[in-house]
């Protein structure tokens, strides 16, 4: 039987130091190219091997980035979001939303009236 898939959403503040080749990740999303339907938010699409984000280890592909150095990423064009990161300076603070998939056991297993008690 299939289990129900739920999501656990958590937020985290991640402070990155720009490395010799930058922050080391790619983003998708923005008001002009929604990555998630009805959501113009900015999402991490790729973490570059040996880049600053990969070496830090906390930022994950699929994370939603809510703000950069306290600046909200809501309602931005994709390129405006990219430019915000590129101009964010040496020390960069990211507020991110992790969405973890949680598997809830098979539907109907030990439901009401199940004699296996």
């Amino acid at each position: 039987m299939n289990g129900r898939v739920d999501y656990l959403v958590t937020e985290e503040e991640i402070n990155l130091t720009r490395g010799p080749s930058g922050l080391g990740f790619n983003i998708v999303g923005g008001t002009d190219q929604q990555y998630v339907s009805n959501d113009s938010g900015i999402y991490v699409s790729r973490i570059k091997e040996n880049g600053a984000a990969a070496l830090d280890g906390r930022l994950q592909e699929g994370d939603k980035i809510l703000s950069v150095n306290g600046q909200d990423l809501k309602n931005l064009l994709h390129q405006d979001a990219v430019d915000l990161f590129r101009n964010a300076g040496y020390a960069v603070s990211l507020r991110v939303q992790h969405r973890l998939q949680v598997q809830n056991g098979p539907i109907g297993h030990r439901g009401e009236g199940d004699p296996s008690g």
Partner: nanobody, 124 residues
């Protein structure tokens, strides 16, 4: 991803000009950041010029500013590098690169996912 094919390289005398072309195949070519890099014999690959996807902003290495011009024709899925006042030190294999969504500057090779095979430019 996009497939990239460079052309236009060759042998030219110092002070001469060449125009390199980079033809891309793939959807949404106009959204990609495009860059030119070069590798001279015995040297590291270095950034030459780049043009952003959505706005067409251009960036140049100090060594080519005022001599090289990058441009793009999205209708033809092609990026160009016009090289004027060529010098012997411009001799290298020139590579075209495409990337999307990197939060890092376009001068970084890591900002690009797709690369062409390169075209040789020799300035005598």
């Amino acid at each position: 991803h996009v497939q990239l094919v460079e052309s236009g390289g060759g042998l030219v005398q110092a002070g001469g000009s060449l125009r390199l072309s980079c033809a891309g195949s793939g959807r949404s070519f106009s959204s990609y950041d495009m860059g030119w890099f070069r590798r001279a014999p015995g040297k590291e690959r270095e950034f030459v010029a780049a043009i952003s996807g959505s706005r067409g902003s251009t960036y140049y290495a100090d060594s080519v500013k005022g001599r090289f011009t990058i441009s793009r024709d999205n209708a033809k899925n092609t990026v160009y590098l016009q090289m004027n006042s060529l010098k012997p030190e411009d001799t290298a294999v020139y590579y075209c690169a495409a990337g999307f969504g990197s939060v890092d500057g376009l001068e970084y090779s890591g900002s690009y996912d797709d690369w062409g095979q390169g075209t040789q430019v020799t300035v005598s």
